[in-house]
Interface confidence: low
């Protein structure tokens, strides 16, 4: 099977490849001789033969043709031969051997046929790595061997190659002289020429330039070795928005295909809801009534604003209403959806409202709610309000459609009163407290009586009295001497008990006086 | 004479930070490339980076993060840094020279190689 | 990163013999007309010693009878005679690619 020539090999010189003879110089001419033959493809070779290896002191000399160096620095040298075993030859003795010797001359011009051993130079001594004995011989296997040589650098415009045989029974089937370069190539989207290596250790360095529709993302740069190879690569080119890397190459994304970036990702199907038509787009157009808020990446479907709450469940408690309701149907595809709370105070017209009290709270907030119930306190009692549940998106105040809400309407009751803010301790007597305390701030309604609840402290309320009061004072009898008893008072309208007071601590005397005046603790 | 020689610090503490410094003779670091690789007592060898003869470093991307190598061509000394060393950073630690002109990545010529016990 | 099998992982061959050790890439180690697969010798309390470069190329100092061959993502190492000195472990190393990657070695004993 043929082998291919690397590409990054230029023949200067290929034997094979000459028709006819090669009319190289050969001296002594009983030395080298030309022979035609036949390649292992069976094509027709010319061939130089020398096998004088019962004669002493062989110096059989063959000089190529004059080779033009063109742009190489460093050259190699490609030989392909069969030499034959000595130990496979009879009665040879000292005079066989197994190895031939290239030379080369640099020179500027062709010297014809005058030829001086004398001014070439010394490559390397070749040898076999497989010779072939008498038997191969007659089996026709010749062992082919291929040896490279690398010479350099070559300073003058051409150059000669010479073989000198000192005794070798030795085939030269081909010859091939070339060079390396590093072959055009397109790299990281960067094209780099066809570039001939340095010949020292030192690599060339090649500035990339970016394929059509791409642009530097680092300078893209190689090195070009002397072997012809071209080295890591550094840097890099990316196909610009609206361009992929296709087969080397940035190629427009296709109508149904977007990429919004510079860089080396592909074209990406346009997302649900948008498309676009054109050949290179860098984002895809919204269907109507579908938006993209200005945080949503181009990757991101359109999407559009929710539908209504559903499903509003109202529970009023006093003047304070927990409200409930369920998620839209239709979120519009959006996972941002929160929940804003209009209040309106109404009239017994319904239609007479007005925004309601900022003193109105909303728990846990009015506005932003992520979860479906809030809680609205501190209403009026005895009034009319209407709550607007607005559902909205991050897409909402793109669309011109109107609000999507769900309401309902409540009527608040009266409100239980504010808690007893301070208890005073006005008398204490060996088995008797007596107590008094303001009326609640806000009574909302008139005060029935009051619920005087308490129990001596290191019960831990595990059994405690409760007594009711018409007033806003009480003596307590029937206790023990030097203890401590926590009080809590609540008030009670029309609505029902307000809650209780913070806990109040009393003690009582410890002997038969009595102290009066104390103030709570 | 072709020579490279590594000097380290023999014991580094887990966590800590290891300094290697190899220096050559008888070649110019302008021109050839030193790699560094490593082999933990009785296994294999693990290439970890070089430098080439212009500067310009390749790393094992396993070890990038941890990793180091500098140069001093006037000094003939290659450096090699690592850092957050754990027990299973003990090795020996080799530095050796790549074939330089054809850039092959074959490393002719190795130093002896320098001991490095992770240890508190 | 190509992963370098070595094969056997140990073997055992008597003086004069022929020893041949495999070497096979997760992926070809050939470009441009090379096969970028290395050869080295190491001896116990000794650095590795490059044998062969580019897969036959012997390195400097190396005797004839070591040889290596293969393309692609097959490679071989033959060492023939066999002589007490080279009893070692032998690693190949490809350099295709970076991370350079090393095999697991194969020891060669003398019998």
């Known amino acids: 099977e043929l082998i291919p020539q690397p590409s990054n090999e230029v023949n200067l010189l290929d034997s094979k490849t000459i028709q006819g003879e090669l009319g190289w110089i050969s001296y002594p001419s009983h030395g080298w001789e030309e022979i035609s033959g036949v390649d292992e493809h069976y094509t027709p070779i010319r061939t130089y033969q020398v096998c004088n290896v019962m004669d002493h002191s062989q110096n059989n000399w063959l000089r190529t043709n004059w080779v033009p160096r063109n742009s190489a620095q460093k050259i190699y040298v490609e030989l392909k031969f069969t030499l034959r075993d000595c130990n496979s030859i009879p009665l040879v003795l000292g005079t066989c051997k197994e190895t031939f010797n290239l030379y080369y001359m640099e020179s500027d011009d062709d010297h014809g046929v005058k030829f001086r051993e004398h001014q070439f130079t010394k490559i390397d001594t070749i040898a076999a790595d497989e010779s072939f004995t008498q038997m191969d011989l007659g089996d026709r296997i010749l062992k082919l061997n291929t040896e490279i040589r690398e010479v350099g650098p070559v300073n003058k415009k051409g150059f000669y190659l010479a073989f000198q045989d000192v005794g070798a029974c030795v085939a030269l089937v081909s010859v091939r002289v070339y060079f390396k370069k590093c072959p055009f190539t397109v790299k990281n989207l960067a094209m780099f020429p066809d570039t001939v290596p340095m010949d020292s250790q030192s690599l060339v360095e090649v500035r990339g330039s970016c394929v059509n529709n791409s642009k530097e993302e680092d300078p893209p740069r190689m090195y070009c070795s002397t072997e012809g190879e071209w080295l890591v690569p550094i840097g890099k080119c990316s196909c610009n928005a609206g361009y992929e890397e296709r087969g080397f190459m940035c190629q427009a994304c296709r109508p149904g295909f977007y990429k919004a970036l510079d860089g080396n990702m592909k074209c990406a199907k346009c997302p649900p809801h948008s498309s676009t038509q054109e050949d290179g787009s860098m984002n895809c157009r919204c269907e109507n009534n579908y938006f993209r808020a200005d945080k949503d990446p181009p990757s991101m479907a359109c999407t559009r604003p929710p539908s209504s709450p559903r499903n509003v469940i109202s529970n009023i408690n006093e003047t304070s209403v927990i409200l409930d309701w369920s998620w839209p149907l239709d979120t519009g595809g959006r996972k941002d959806v929160t929940f804003n709370i209009i209040c309106k105070k109404c009239g017994w017209n319904i239609k007479q409202c007005e925004p309601c009290s900022p003193n109105v709270r909303f728990l846990p907030r009015q506005f932003g709610l992520t979860n479906t119930t809030v809680t609205v306190t501190d209403l009026l009692a005895h009034t009319n309000y209407t709550f607007e549940i607005d559902a909205v998106n991050g897409v909402s105040e793109l669309s011109s459609p109107p609000r999507q809400f769900a309401a309902v309407s409540i009527t608040t009751n009266q409100a239980a009163p504010s808690p007893v803010l301070t208890i005073k301790k006005d008398r204490t007597s060996r088995n008797s407290i007596s107590l008094s305390w303001q009326e609640p701030e806000h009574p909302n309604g008139i005060i029935l009586d009051y619920e005087v609840k308490y129990y001596e402290k290191q019960e831990q309320e595990t059994s405690y009295t409760i007594l009711r009061a018409r007033g806003t004072n009480v003596t307590i009898s029937s206790l023990k001497p030097d203890t401590i008893y926590v009080f809590q008072i609540r008030a009670r309208t029309a609505a029902g008990y307000g809650t209780n007071s913070r806990k109040f601590e009393f003690e009582t005397s410890p002997d038969s006086f009595s102290i009066s005046g104390e103030s709570s603790q | 004479q072709v020579h490279l020689k590594e000097s380290g610090p023999g014991l580094v503490a887990p966590s800590q930070s290891l300094s290697i410094t190899c220096t050559v003779s008888g070649f110019s670091l302008t021109g050839y490339g030193v790699n560094w690789i490593r082999q933990p007592p009785g296994k294999n060898l693990e290439w970890l980076g070089m430098i080439w003869g212009d500067g310009s470093t390749d790393y094992n991307s396993v070890l990038k993060s941890r990793l180091s190598i500098s140069k001093d061509n006037a000094k003939s000394q290659v450096f090699l840094e690592m850092n957050s060393l754990q027990t299973d950073d003990t090795a020996n630690y080799y530095c050796a020279r790549d074939r330089g002109i054809s850039y092959y990545y074959a490393m002719d010529y190795w130093g002896q190689g320098t001991s490095v016990t992770v240890s508190s | 990163d190509i992963v370098l099998t070595q094969s056997p992982a140990s073997l055992a061959v008597s003086l004069g013999q022929r020893a041949t050790i495999s070497c096979r890439a997760s992926?070809?180690?050939?470009?441009?007309?090379?096969?970028?697969l290395h050869w080295y010798q190491q001896k116990p309390g000794q650095p590795p010693k490059l044998l062969i470069f580019l897969a036959y190329n012997l390195g400097s100092g190396v005797p004839a009878r070591f040889s290596g061959s293969g393309a692609g993502t097959d490679f071989t190492l033959n060492i023939h005679p066999v002589e007490e000195e080279d009893a070692a472990t032998y690693y190949c190393?490809?350099?295709?690619?970076?991370?350079?990657?090393f095999g697991a070695g194969t020891k060669l004993e003398l019998k």
């Open positions: 190393q490809h350099s295709r690619e970076f991370p350079l990657t």
């Open positions: 992926k070809s180690v050939s470009a441009s007309g090379y096969s970028y």
